[in-house]
């Protein structure tokens, strides 16, 4: 009985610029097939607990699964299948009409170059001077990878870092993001976004740590020289960062064009797709190159900002030049100017 738990099961994720997210395709005896999200009695709008697909992510050498559900932008290959029985079982599948199939999408965490420890060191009174100092980013539950409250551990001591908004620390933030293998620093997160607010029912290991640190040298080049221990503060901000390696990234698609390589740009917020509104401050091919690449098309040829004559036209807005820098999309409820992008067709 073939299922995605079997050791010889073969899968791939397509239609994105990462091997760790995209449309799920599986290899059965007669070739590769796209899996419809209506499989296993699900509806094409239903989202699953992604942890059920952890074996697939593992097999693709990716990190933990972040989302499992309708991919929403369906590119139908030669063959699509609907499967029956238990979730993840492929022993009873039938071919589906392409126009009836909504593809199943899976997003796994991109693999880290080296795996930092995933658990906090337990509070202990025994000094461990040999343990090298290290950092950890603590995200909200369901939050993003490479985004969250920074915790610093030195030996057995660990805790958050006190941060004042006036601190001039850009070099330090870049150093920290880099040390965490999360790219470069993008911005500070408000604590609500970073997940500092504590749920009273949360398990003990996620309660605030007893130690706090203060930035000692914002130009430090090794962790042991960056911070000094202070008495924990009841109030005040803690350092919370968003780094460029955050995941998952905004997904995009082109709709309403004559091919998959042209159309009005839409982006995904949760399970919903909506128009991406023009941003005059980010009006450059830098943004559209990323979109073209995500559609697996060639370089951007042209783009047209469509007039928003209708005051009720709505959509989503990203203030950054590159969509990959957008960790949140803002809703625009009026005068959303859509953008029609034409990319080079990779197979003219």
């Amino acid at each position: 009985r073939l299922s995605w738990y079997d050791p010889d099961f073969q899968a791939r994720l397509t239609r994105s610029n990462s091997k760790c997210q995209g449309q799920l395709e599986v290899y059965l005896k007669d070739g590769w097939h796209m899996v419809c999200s209506q499989s296993w009695g699900r509806s094409s709008k239903q989202w699953e607990d992604p942890s059920q697909a952890s074996k697939v992510c593992q097999r693709l050498n990716c990190g933990v699964p972040l989302s499992l559900g309708p991919f929403l932008v369906t590119y139908t290959p030669q063959s699509s299948i609907i499967c029956y029985g238990q979730l993840g079982s492929f022993s009873n599948c039938s071919h589906s009409r392409n126009d009836m199939c909504h593809s199943l999408g899976l997003t796994c965490l991109e693999p880290q170059k080296t795996t930092p420890p995933t658990t906090r060191p337990p509070p202990t009174t025994t000094p461990e001077p040999t343990a090298p100092p290290r950092l950890q980013l603590v995200a909200q539950s369901g939050g993003q990878h490479c985004a969250g409250v920074v915790e610093f551990y030195s030996g057995s001591l660990g805790g958050t870092i006190s941060y004042e908004a006036q601190d001039k620390t850009q070099d330090l933030e870049n150093f920290l993001c880099n040390n965490l293998q999360c790219g470069s620093f993008l911005k500070h997160l408000p604590e609500t976004e970073a997940g500092r607010a504590q749920d009273p029912g949360e398990p003990r290991e996620h309660q605030p740590l007893p130690i706090q640190w203060k930035i000692q040298n914002s130009s430090c080049t090794s962790l042991e020289h960056c911070f000094r221990k202070i008495k924990p503060q009841k109030s005040g901000r803690v350092l919370a960062l968003l780094c460029s390696g955050f995941q998952p990234k905004v997904q995009s698609r082109l709709v309403g064009g004559s091919s998959i390589c042209e159309g009005t740009v839409e982006v995904r917020q949760g399970a919903q797709w909506a128009a991406l509104c023009d941003s005059s401050s980010a009006r450059s091919s830098l943004r559209w190159e990323e979109v073209c690449r995500e559609q697996q098309c060639g370089s951007v040829n042209s783009y047209r900002v469509l007039d928003a004559g209708d005051p009720t036209s709505r959509g989503l807005f990203c203030p950054h030049q590159k969509l990959s820098q957008c960790h949140e999309l803002w809703e625009r409820n009026s005068y959303c100017k859509k953008v029609f992008v034409t990319c080079q067709d990779p197979n003219p």
């Epitope: 009006r283 091919s285 951007v300 040829n301 042209s302 783009y303 047209r304 900002v305 469509l306």
Partner: nanobody, 121 residues
Amino acid sequence: EVQLVESGGGLVQAGGSLRLSCAASESTFSITAMGWYRQAPGKQRELVAAITSPGGSTNYADSVKGRFTISRDNAKNTMLLQMNSLKPEDTAVYYCNADINHGSGYYTVSWGQGTQVTVSS
């Protein structure tokens, strides 16, 4: 159509410097943004650095931050990329691109033919 011509590529040792130039065939008045991209054999084309006008805000790939500097010389219709502390992984064909504003919200994107940069170890 705006023609873009890159120059300044070549062979350099690791740790060395190069200065790439991209010349536009007509006034940069209608050019709203310019960028440098690179493509190594068997890899996707990737952003190196970009600059918008008139604000001149810049954007760099993480891998080149602190080593490369992009700038524009509007008087000469050129864009420059100063590349310092070059590494073997910077080896690629470097392309420049420009966004041309045709009015009424319509922009086309022109690409140069590329210039080869090879960094030996």
